[in-house]
Interface confidence: low
């Protein structure tokens, strides 16, 4: 029987009455156009909703927008359009919400063609009040807040100027011209690329990378011949043109660009690309595109300096056309990532790693599912997950996989069970152990969200017809109740809950359509009365993460340590609460070969924990370039996985010797460079 329909499912008592008392409808006095919603701050309950409507006239398009504010998680909204002088707000810039709980909001207004500059509306009190500010430039991008100081903003102008404000957008200063891309780094540092000869496009590969650590008072040129740059974790990456041809190489810095080393990654040609898939302070996942329009490439994982890389996964799906990849960080369990590979027969298969890219496997077949028509063997197949690529291909997949750090072990995703991803209508699957095992949770495509740190899962069927029913589960998707939230069905457009999955409120957005008009409408449902009591100690149970063999002393060891979590029992119907903190107990493991990646020049054959020398490098000295000096690597093929905390046990020898010989990448010996200060 389908999940939720067997006899064992305990009903939540009187839930209809409890939810009916906590369902709040708001009809927006708007013609349907587009709607965007932003949460302002954390646990503040403040939501801003911007609706825009374009009326196409014969010669021009007339736009109208309205701004609404809620301070009770969406139960009630107030029209605050007058606070922004009834100005039309440009939706392509969105609402720029400040970091942390700064309460800052910037809205960018549409201005008439001949104006000297743009116009913004600024609020620093969670959108209670706004100040209108006319800009000395026309913005090209949304205002970007410094992560360290929300008073510091940067923006690019339509004329490629880099503008900075030190007083939250009150006063602006152009600190540099001819800027292509700008990003905040740490310590209020700004990194940006500049062109010399005409345009960003024309100078691609001949850009200069600049840094200012004092908001534009002075600059340092930290790289030339730049194609692009990126920041990830504590790493700064630049892809740099080679001197003699049109290839590019990645260079990496861990000190904000003062010193650079060439990453031991393949160079790429004009049609290829690099992509940082994920990065933290320990390491980086880097995708390197294959030559030709193959739609795939190779994932490499870095050492702790971002310099030496190990091949992690071949034939990794990453389309050049739409730039789509299914690479997903499973945030509910440490070390887990899911992605797709393009197999030799051009079918797409899902792979999962539990040890930060050390080894990849297929997803285990859900026990309550049958293999579909893609399976050659009806008894042996895997679960394949639909993510960004499927969504881009317009498959019937309304949502990407979902996981939350505070809902430990829970992963929800659309998928199909077979030898590869199927184009048939997918079902929704859930894992409660970070991706090791899976269960079919809901039949057919759904929108879903996690509330109360996993205490409640909410879902709405994906349908082209109007809907009026929401489903919810209090036991991690085993059993489902349905609740009719309105008599009159609405055309559903989205589910909204406060980021962080701590809230117990869910907002259902949609529009009503009648003969004369259509209007935006939202229903906010508060589940607090379903989870009547606060969870107590007895409601939690100890769970060992990454456990695959309880008999093994090293069971659960991943990246050198194991973690025991206190997790809510599925049978407990109670509130984790907004202040819930994940309780975990780590313990260090002995080192095994699993705690080491294969070093530069080595690889790990499939289903083998030993690293063997790459045939093409056998007998060659392993030398690589570090900070412009040639280094000699003495290794027996292993290096500790970044972030691995194991102690004792296996200890492969690894030594790096400075050969005292100069080696330069072209990055450190470019042809020309300018440097200047304000």
């Amino acid at each position: 029987s389908a999940p939720g329909e067997d006899e064992e499912c305990g009903r939540v008592r009187d839930f209809v009455a409890k939810l009916a008392n906590n369902t709040h409808q708001h009809v927006f006095d708007d013609l349907r156009g587009s709607v965007s919603l932003s949460w302002v701050g954390d646990s503040t309950g403040v939501i801003l909703v911007l609706t825009t409507f374009h009326v196409p006239l014969v010669i021009m398009t007339f736009g109208q927008s309205k701004l609404y504010r809620s301070e009770d998680y969406g139960k009630n909204f107030k029209d605050i359009t007058d606070l922004i002088n009834n100005t039309f707000i440009r939706t392509e810039f969105g609402m720029a919400i400040g970091p942390e709980n700064s309460g800052k909001v910037v809205l960018t207004a549409e201005v008439s063609g001949g104006s000297r500059g743009g116009r913004i509306f600024r609020s620093s009190d969670f959108a209670k009040n706004f100040v209108q500010t006319d800009l000395p430039f026309h913005p090209l991008t949304q205002m970007m807040y410094s992560p360290q100081n929300s008073d510091y903003l940067l923006a690019l102008s339509t004329e490629n100027g880099l503008w900075v404000s030190k007083n939250f957008g009150g006063k602006w200063e152009e600190i540099h011209k001819a800027v292509c891309l700008a990003k905040w780094g740490s310590d209020n540092t700004i990194f940006f690329t500049t062109y010399a000869n005409g345009s960003c496009k024309a100078d691609l590969g001949a850009l200069e990378l600049w840094r200012t650590s004092d908001l534009g008072k002075s600059f340092k040129t930290i790289g030339v011949k730049i194609y692009s740059f990126g920041l990830g974790g504590r790493f700064l990456f630049a892809s740099v043109m080679a001197d003699k041809d049109t290839t590019r190489r990645i260079h990496v810095s861990t000190d904000q660009g003062d010193t650079w080393s060439m990453a031991q990654l393949p160079s790429v040609g004009q049609e290829q690309f690099y992509s940082i898939l994920a990065a933290n302070d320990d390491m980086v996942f880097m995708h390197v595109d294959e030559p030709g329009d193959t739609g795939f490439g190779t994932i490499f994982t870095s050492d702790d300096r971002g310099i030496v890389y190990s091949k992690s996964l071949d034939r990794h799906l990453y389309t050049t056309t739409g730039g789509e990849t299914d690479f997903t960080n499973v945030t509910s369990l440490r070390g887990v990532y899911i992605t797709s590979v393009l197999s030799e027969d051009n079918s797409i298969q899902t792979m999962i790693t539990f040890d930060q890219g050390g080894r990849w496997t297929h997803l285990r077949k859900p026990e309550n599912s049958e293999c579909d028509a893609t399976a050659k063997n009806k008894n042996e197949c895997s679960l394949h997950i639909h993510a960004s690529y499927s969504i881009s291909q317009k498959l019937n997949v309304p949502m990407a996989p979902l996981s939350e750090p505070n809902a430990v072990g829970i992963v929800i995703a659309h998928g199909s069970v077979g030898d590869a991803i199927s184009v048939m209508v997918p079902d929704v699957y859930i894992s409660d152990d970070g991706g090791y095992s899976w269960t079919k949770m809901l039949e057919g495509p759904h929108y879903y969200t996690i509330l109360d740190s996993g205490g409640i899962i909410v879902a709405i069927e994906h349908s082209s017809r109007p809907i009026n029913v929401i489903k919810f589960s209090t036991d991690e998707g085993q059993c489902w109740q349905t609740y009719t939230f309105t008599r009159d069905p609405i055309y559903f457009t989205g589910l909204a809950s406060e980021p962080g999955a701590r809230s117990m409120n869910i907002s259902i957005w949609g529009f009503t359509e009648s003969f004369l008009t259509s209007q935006w409408v939202s229903y906010t449902i508060d589940f607090k009365d379903i989870l009547e009591r606060n969870c107590e100690e007895k409601d939690y149970t100890i769970w060992l993460a990454h456990s695959t063999d309880p008999e093994d002393y090293e069971d659960g060891c991943i990246l050198g340590y194991k973690e025991q979590f206190l997790r809510l029992r599925k049978s407990s119907v109670c509130q984790n609460g907004r202040d819930y903190v994940v309780t975990k107990q780590p313990s260090i493991c002995l080192c095994s070969l699993e705690d080491f990646l294969c070093d530069f020049g080595y690889y790990r054959p499939e289903n083998d924990s030993k690293c063997v020398e790459q045939p093409e490098l056998k007998g060659h000295d392993l030398e690589f370039c570090l900070y412009g000096r040639e280094e000699h690597l003495t290794t027996n093929g292993y290096r500790k996985i970044p972030g691995d905390k194991c102690q004792g046990g296996v200890n492969p020898v690894r030594e790096v010797k400075d050969l005292k010989k100069k080696c330069t990448s072209n990055f450190l010996s470019p042809e020309k460079q300018n440097s200047k200060s304000n």
């Epitope: 310590d187 840094r211 650590s213 340092k220 900070y627 010996s669 200060s677």
Partner: antibody, heavy 117, light 108 residues
Framework: EVQLVESGGGLVQPGGSLRLSCAAS????????MSWVRQAPGKGLEWVAT????????YYPDILKGRFTISRDNAKNSLYLQMNSLRAEDTAVYYC??????????WGQGTLVTVSS | DIQMTQSPSSLSASVGDRVTITCRVS??????LAWYQQKPGKSPKLLVY???NIADGVPSRFSGSGSGTDYTLTISSLQPEDFATYYC??????????FGQGTKLEIK
């Protein structure tokens, strides 16, 4: 007006330790990198250490690594240099300097460190 | 490490003279060079940054030029207060950000 005032210098025996301080005023301290530079009697300038604006990144010449530690307290607008295992050749006037990127634009008046038995 | 060679190490000149001090670097530093002036018993003062930019409050008779590995500080018309020691310093790439050994400018 930008001001940098060093203190903490003095006479110390070889092998001893000393902590220099630099009090900054007249500018927004927490957005600037800061450096220490020294000058032995009758000799040229020698770069000693640099610290980034938030204190995340520190730099030293190889010969001083391990003995000298640069740090800062942005709440107090102060820069420090902890010097351990001092040698006679560390005798110098030590300057603190504001270091915005491509230059050291303001310097303190210096504090004399004498290492002698 | 990048080596800085400043020349001359000392120089005698008269008030009104045009004076040039050069700094040669062991590798291309892409204009990441500063010049400082130091008078006896005083702390150094920034004159030029990024090879060619004059610091605030510095008289216009001082100018910086150069690129690649060769850089020059020029004083167009020497004044009595210009007699001092001058240092160059690079800020390219890898620390250490070395100073030149200095040029002592004396009255003839």
């Amino acid at each position: 007006e930008v001001q940098l005032v060093e203190s903490g210098g003095g006479l110390v025996q070889p092998g001893g330790s000393l902590r220099l301080s630099c009090a900054a005023s007249g500018f927004t301290f927490n957005i600037y990198g800061m450096s220490w530079v020294r000058q032995a009697p009758g000799k040229g300038l020698e770069w000693v250490a640099t610290i980034s604006s938030g204190g995340i990144y520190t730099y030293y010449p190889d010969i001083l690594k391990g003995r000298f530690t640069i740090s800062r307290d942005n709440a107090k607008n102060s820069l420090y240099l902890q010097m351990n295992s001092l040698r006679a050749e560390d005798t110098a006037v030590y300057y603190c300097a504001r270091h915005p990127g491509g230059a050291m634009d303001y310097w303190g008046q210096g504090t004399l460190v004498t290492v002698s038995s | 490490d990048i080596q800085m060679t400043q020349s001359p190490s000392s120089l005698s000149a008269s008030v009104g003279d045009r004076v040039t001090i050069t700094c040669r670097v062991s590798e291309n530093i892409y204009s990441n060079l500063a010049w400082y002036q130091q008078k006896p018993g005083k702390s150094p003062k920034l004159l030029v940054y990024a090879a060619t930019n004059i610091a605030d409050g510095v008289p216009s008779r001082f100018s910086g030029s150069g690129s690649g590995t060769d850089y020059t500080l020029t004083i167009s018309s020497l004044q009595p207060e210009d007699f001092a020691t001058y240092y160059c310093q690079h800020f390219w790439g890898t620390p250490p950000w070395t100073f030149g050994q200095g040029t002592k400018l004396e009255i003839k």
